[in-house]
C-alpha cells in the first residue's frame, strides 16, 4: 500500500523585535518531535510593522494597538488556528527602549504595558514584553547565526549545507548593527576575558563556550549620526553645518530640540544661539571618516587592549557574520560580495559620497529620501566602526561575511531568543535516535 503522509506535527513560535527604528515580527516553525535537534527551527514569515519603533509612541500610546494589528493578524493567518493557543509570543525591545528607560522608567513601563495589553488580546500564548539587555542581544545573535550555520552539530559533514560553512566546528563571531546600539560577540582564542561584564559561559549540545560580548549603546547608526551632528554643531560658526557625510547639494533643517532629545547627545549638549540649523552636504568620505573617529575615545584603556571608550576587546578570532544594518547598508551599496576587499570598499565609498545629491536621487528614485540621504554616513560609519572601533584590518576584512539570511532565516537575535525561552538548545548533546517513521502509515 502507498505511504500516506499524516498531518505534520509541527510547532510555531513568534518573536517581535522592537528595535529603535521599527518593529519586525518573525514566525518560526519546527517539527514537534525534533525540538532538541540542532538546525530544525526555521523562519516561515517576517512581517515589518509599519511605523517607527515603539519608543516613539511614548506620547501616543493609544495608537500602539493599531500599530501592531496588521502583523499580528498576519500571524493569525499563517499559523493554523488549531495551533494558536500553543504558540508562544515574545516581544523583546532593544536599545531604543533602553534609552527611553534611561530617560524615564515610568514612560518605558507605560509603553511596555500598553504593548502587552495589545498583544494579550490575540489568541496566542503571550509570554510578555521586555527590554532585553545589550549582553542578551549580542549573545542571542551569536546563538542564532551559529545554530543556523550548523556549528552546534557534532556531526561533521563532507558537504556544505550552508554558505560560509567551513567544515570545522569553529563558531562564527557575530557583528550586529542596529539604529541605537551595536554588538560584537565571539569566542576569543585562549584569551582570558579581562572584564567579567563581557564574559558569557554557555554549555550547548555538550560543549562549553567562553564567549566575549559587548553592546555599545548610542553607537547604532542612527544614534551615532545624532552624536556626530551634536559634536559638529558645537564648533559651527553659525546655523549652517557643512557636513562631509552627506552628498554635495543635500540640505536639511534640524531642530536643536530633536538633536538633544536623546541621551546619546547629552555629552555634547550646549546652549546654542539658534533653535534650528541647516545641514549642507559636501560629500567627502575622508573628512566624514575623520569626524566619525572623534566619537570613539581611544585614549583610555584599562585593559591589555580595548575597542573604544575604555571597553575591553580581545584579539579578533575567526570568521564573523555581520548582519542587521551592517548587511542592509552594505547590500544597498552593493558591497556584500566576499570578493570585495576593504580597500575596494573604501574606494567605492569615496565615489558614492562624492556623488551630487540630485544625481543620487535620480539613480535611486524608488528609495525614500530620508534613508537614501544617510547611506553615505552609514557606509562610512560601518567602515570606521569595524576598522578603528573593532580593529579589523585590510587582511582580516575577508573574515567578515555580510549576512542577511541563513537557510531562509534572518540573521539577528530573535531566533536565539526564542530557542532559549522555549528550552530548545539543550546543554547536553541529545542521544541520537533512529530516524522517526511516525509521520507515515
Amino acid at each position: 500500500t502507498q505511504n500516506k503522509a499524516l498531518p505534520e506535527n509541527v510547532k510555531y513560535g513568534i518573536v517581535l523585535d522592537a528595535g529603535s527604528s521599527h518593529t519586525s515580527l518573525y514566525i518560526y516553525k519546527w517539527p514537534a518531535e525534533k525540538e532538541n535537534d540542532t538546525g530544525v527551527v526555521h523562519q516561515v514569515e517576517e512581517c515589518r510593522v509599519k511605523g517607527p519603533g515603539i519608543s516613539k509612541f511614548v506620547q501616543k500610546v493609544n495608537e500602539i494597538g493599531i500599530y501592531l494589528t496588521d502583523c499580528m493578524e498576519r500571524a493569525r493567518e499563517v499559523i493554523p488556528r488549531s495551533q494558536h493557543q500553543e504558540t508562544p509570543v515574545y516581544l523583546g525591545a532593544t536599545a531604543g527602549m533602553r534609552l527611553l528607560r534611561m530617560e524615564s522608567e515610568e514612560l518605558a513601563d507605560r509603553v511596555l504595558d500598553v504593548v502587552e495589553r495589545s498583544l494579550s488580546n490575540y489568541p496566542f500564548d503571550f509570554q510578555g514584553a521586555r527590554i532585553i539587555t545589550g549582553q542578551e542581544e549580542g549573545a542571542y545573535g551569536w546563538i542564532t547565526i551559529n545554530y543556523l550555520l550548523g556549528k552546534f552539530s557534532q556531526k561533521t559533514r563532507w558537504f556544505s549545507i550552508v554558505p560560509y560553512e567551513t567544515n570545522n566546528q569553529e563558531t562564527f563571531g557575530a557583528l550586529d548593527l542596529g539604529g541605537a546600539s551595536t554588538q560584537v560577540t565571539f569566542v576569543p582564542q585562549n584569551q582570558t576575558i579581562e572584564s567579567p561584564d563581557n564574559a558569557l559561559q554557555f554549555r550547548l549540545y555538550g560543549k562549553d563556550y567562553n564567549v566575549y560580548t559587548h553592546s555599545f549603546l548610542c553607537y547604532g547608526k542612527d544614534q551615532a549620526l545624532w552624536q556626530k551632528l551634536a559634536k559638529d554643531i558645537q564648533v559651527a560658526s553659525n546655523e549652517i553645518l557643512r557636513d562631509p557625510c552627506f552628498h554635495p547639494g543635500y540640505k536639511k533643517v534640524v531642530n536643536v530640540s530633536d538633536l538633544y532629545k536623546t541621551p546619546c547627545t547629552k555629552r555634547f549638549e550646549m546652549t546654542l544661539p539658534f533653535q534650528q540649523f541647516e545641514i549642507q552636504g559636501i560629500g567627502n568620505y575622508q573628512q566624514c571618516h575623520q569626524s566619525i573617529l572623534e566619537l570613539f575615545n581611544t585614549s583610555y584603556c584599562p585593559y591589555s587592549q580595548c575597542a573604544f571608550n575604555g571597553i575591553f576587546l580581545p584579539p579578533l578570532q575567526g570568521d564573523f557574520g555581520a548582519f542587521s544594518a551592517f548587511y542592509f547598508v552594505m547590500k544597498f551599496l552593493n558591497l556584500t560580495s566576499e570578493k570585495v576587499s576593504q580597500e575596494k570598499v573604501t574606494e567605492m565609498m569615496k565615489k558614492f559620497c562624492a556623488q551630487p545629491w540630485e544625481e543620487i536621487k535620480t539613480s535611486y528614485a524608488g528609495v525614500k529620501e530620508k534613508y537614501l540621504s544617510e547611506y553615505c554616513f552609514s557606509g562610512t560609519y560601518i567602515l570606521s566602526l569595524l576598522l578603528q572601533g573593532y580593529h579589523f584590518t585590510a587582511d582580516s576584512w575577508e573574515h567578515i561575511h555580510f549576512i542577511g539570511k541563513i537557510q531562509g532565516s534572518d540573521a539577528g537575535w530573535t531566533l536565539g531568543y526564542m530557542l532559549n525561552l522555549t528550552n530548545m538548545i539543550p546543554a547536553e548533546q541529545p542521544l541520537s535516535t533512529p530516524l522517526s517513521h511516525s509521520t507515515y502509515v
Epitope: 493609544n62 500602539i64 494597538g65 513601563d109 507605560r110 504595558d113 500598553v114 495589553r117 503571550f126
Partner: antibody
Framework: QVQLVQSGAEVKKPGSSVKVSCKAS????????ISWVRQAPGQGLEWMGS????????NYAQKFQGRVTITADESTSTVYMELSSLRSEDTAVYYC??????????????WGRGTLVTVSS | EIVMTQSPATLSVSPGERATLSCRAS??????LAWYQQKPGQAPRLLIY???TRATGIPARFSGSGSGTEFTLTISSLQSEDFAVYYC?????????FGGGTKVEIK
C-alpha cells in the same frame, strides 16, 4: 481620598446583557489601569479584563473575549463593564479594582465594594 | 495562562500562632506576586506586592517571601481579625490570575 463607587445590584435574564459602572469618587482615576474581577458565590477571584481610562486601551481574558466590553468615560471618571449573553454561571459579585502602576505593577491597591449580578429566569 | 495553586485550602490555627500559606505558579513569575485578604461580604484588601513588600498600613506580622514559582505568606502571630480567606495573584503576565484561596480559620 479616592474611592471606587460601583453601581447597584442587578437581576438579569439569561441571554441578556448587564452594564456595571465604577466611578472614581473624591478624585479622578490615576493614569493606570482599572480591572474587573468577579467572584461567584463561595468561589475564588477571576480576572475578566482591564482598561487604561486615559488611553482607552482594553484587554480581556480569553474566556470572556467577545462577550465582555470595558469602556471608560474620562469626563465623568467612570469605567463600565458590559457582559452579554448572560448565563446562570455569570451570577457573581463584580468588582472594579485599580491597578497600582504600569507593566509589572498590575496588582490591585484599591477595590470597589462590588456589584452583585444575579442571572435567573 | 499562568495557573496559581494555593495550599492548603483550609488552615486551622489558634490565635497567637504562626500561619504559613503557600502559593505555586505554573511558570516563573519572578517576584511579581501579590497577596490579598478577604473577609466575608467585603472586597479583597492588598497585603503584599512584589512577593515581599508590605502595602501601606499592613501590620509587620504579615510577611511574604519567594520568587520564581514558589511563594509563602507568613502571619507571625495570628490576631482575631486575621481569620479570613487569602488569595495570591501573579502580576507578571496577562491574563492576571489568582490562586484558589486559603481559608484561615480558628482552631
Amino acid at each position: 481620598q479616592v474611592q471606587l463607587v460601583q453601581s447597584g445590584a442587578e437581576v438579569k435574564k439569561p441571554g441578556s446583557s448587564v452594564k456595571v459602572s465604577c466611578k472614581a469618587s473624591g478624585g479622578t482615576f490615576s493614569s493606570y489601569g482599572i480591572s474587573w474581577v468577579r467572584q461567584a458565590p463561595g468561589q475564588g477571584l477571576e480576572w475578566m479584563g482591564s482598561i487604561i481610562p486615559q488611553f482607552g486601551t482594553a484587554n480581556y481574558a480569553q474566556k470572556f473575549q467577545g462577550r465582555v466590553t470595558i469602556t471608560a468615560d474620562e469626563s465623568t471618571s467612570t469605567v463600565y463593564m458590559e457582559l452579554s449573553s448572560l448565563r446562570s454561571e455569570d451570577t457573581a459579585v463584580y468588582y472594579c479594582a485599580r491597578e497600582a502602576g504600569y507593566y509589572r505593577y498590575r496588582y490591585f491597591d484599591l477595590w470597589g465594594r462590588g456589584t452583585l449580578v444575579t442571572v435567573s429566569s | 495562562e499562568i495557573v496559581m495553586t494555593q495550599s492548603p485550602a483550609t488552615l486551622s490555627v489558634s490565635p497567637g500562632e504562626r500561619a504559613t500559606l503557600s502559593c505555586r505558579a505554573s511558570q516563573s513569575v519572578s517576584s511579581n506576586l501579590a497577596w490579598y485578604q478577604q473577609k466575608p461580604g467585603q472586597a479583597p484588601r492588598l497585603l503584599i506586592y512584589g512577593a515581599s513588600t508590605r502595602a501601606t498600613g499592613i501590620p509587620a506580622r504579615f510577611s511574604g517571601s519567594g520568587s520564581g514559582t514558589e511563594f509563602t505568606l507568613t502571619i507571625s502571630s495570628l490576631q482575631s481579625e486575621d481569620f479570613a480567606v487569602y488569595y495570591c495573584q501573579q502580576h507578571a503576565l496577562w491574563p492576571l490570575t489568582f490562586g484558589g484561596g486559603t481559608k484561615v480559620e480558628i482552631k
